[in-house]
């Protein structure tokens, strides 16, 4: 079954290469287990950035080497991606699956365009 997922259109990463955005899903019921996948689309290529599952009210559990962290609040997931560089600029798409209880729902957002600007190197001091 399809589900609506909303996310901001544009986000600018900080000078430290950190970008945060909210992914909100219109849950038809009371999901207790949710899977969230962040995908990056650039030059018509789509790659998985990170994925996590969580029980409602708990922190998102990403893999140890993930560049993503996140928290959940109700039907909102607050995602943070770190270690971004200019070459990582692209459309970051939020995919949400309500895993339990049945029925299963899946929703895909329209994506958040994340712009990353590499900081200028500090000039050498004499």
């Amino acid at each position: 079954k399809a589900m609506h997922v909303a996310q901001p259109a544009v986000v600018l990463a900080s000078s430290r290469g950190i970008a945060s955005f909210v992914c909100e899903y219109a849950s038809p019921g009371k999901a207790t287990e949710v899977r969230v996948t962040v995908l990056r689309q650039a030059d018509s290529q789509v790659t998985e950035v990170c994925a996590a599952t969580y029980m409602m009210g708990n922190e998102l559990t990403f893999l140890d080497d993930s560049i993503c962290t996140g928290t959940s609040s109700g039907n909102q997931v607050n995602l943070t991606i770190q270690g971004l560089r200019a070459m990582d600029t692209g459309l970051y798409i939020c995919k949400v699956e309500l895993m339990y209880p049945p029925p299963y729902y899946l929703g895909i957002g329209n994506g958040t365009q994340i712009y990353v600007i590499d900081p200028e190197p500090c000039p050498d001091s004499d």
Epitope: A2, L39, V46, E48, K95, L106, I108
Partner: nanobody, 119 residues
């Protein structure tokens, strides 16, 4: 159109095992993920397990974790669901599904195979 064909369902006693298979005859899987779902009478479709075709990463519903194993055979273009320690509450029609791509939903579905666990 991808045609998924399941097999391996049947009647088994509680504590027994079954292995379900899902194949796409005459087609090579290039799907992002393959999954298994089930539907008991009068209930919504429930996620059981899935496997990513590229790297074999798996994910299981809590209700089957430690009892069910999903696997794939690239050479045979087949996905399996090994079900051990079956319980009466596992009784349902089991469906195989495929995601056509990373940005897809579950685009393709099999016809379903009945699994009945008697106590």
């Amino acid at each position: 159109e991808v045609q998924l064909v399941e097999s391996g369902g049947g009647l088994v006693q509680a504590g027994g095992s079954l292995r379900l298979s899902c194949a796409a005859p005459g087609r090579t899987f290039s799907n992002y993920a393959m999954g298994w779902f089930r539907q008991a009478p009068g209930k919504g479709r429930e996620f059981v397990a899935d496997i990513r075709w590229s790297d074999g990463r798996t994910y299981y519903a809590d209700s089957v974790k430690g009892r069910f194993t999903v696997s794939r055979d690239n050479a045979k273009n087949t996905v399996y669901l090994q079900m051990n320690s079956l319980k009466p509450e596992d009784t349902a029609v089991y469906y195989c599904a495929a995601q056509g791509g990373v940005l897809s939903g579950w685009d393709y579905w099999g016809q379903g195979t009945q699994v009945t666990v008697s106590s």
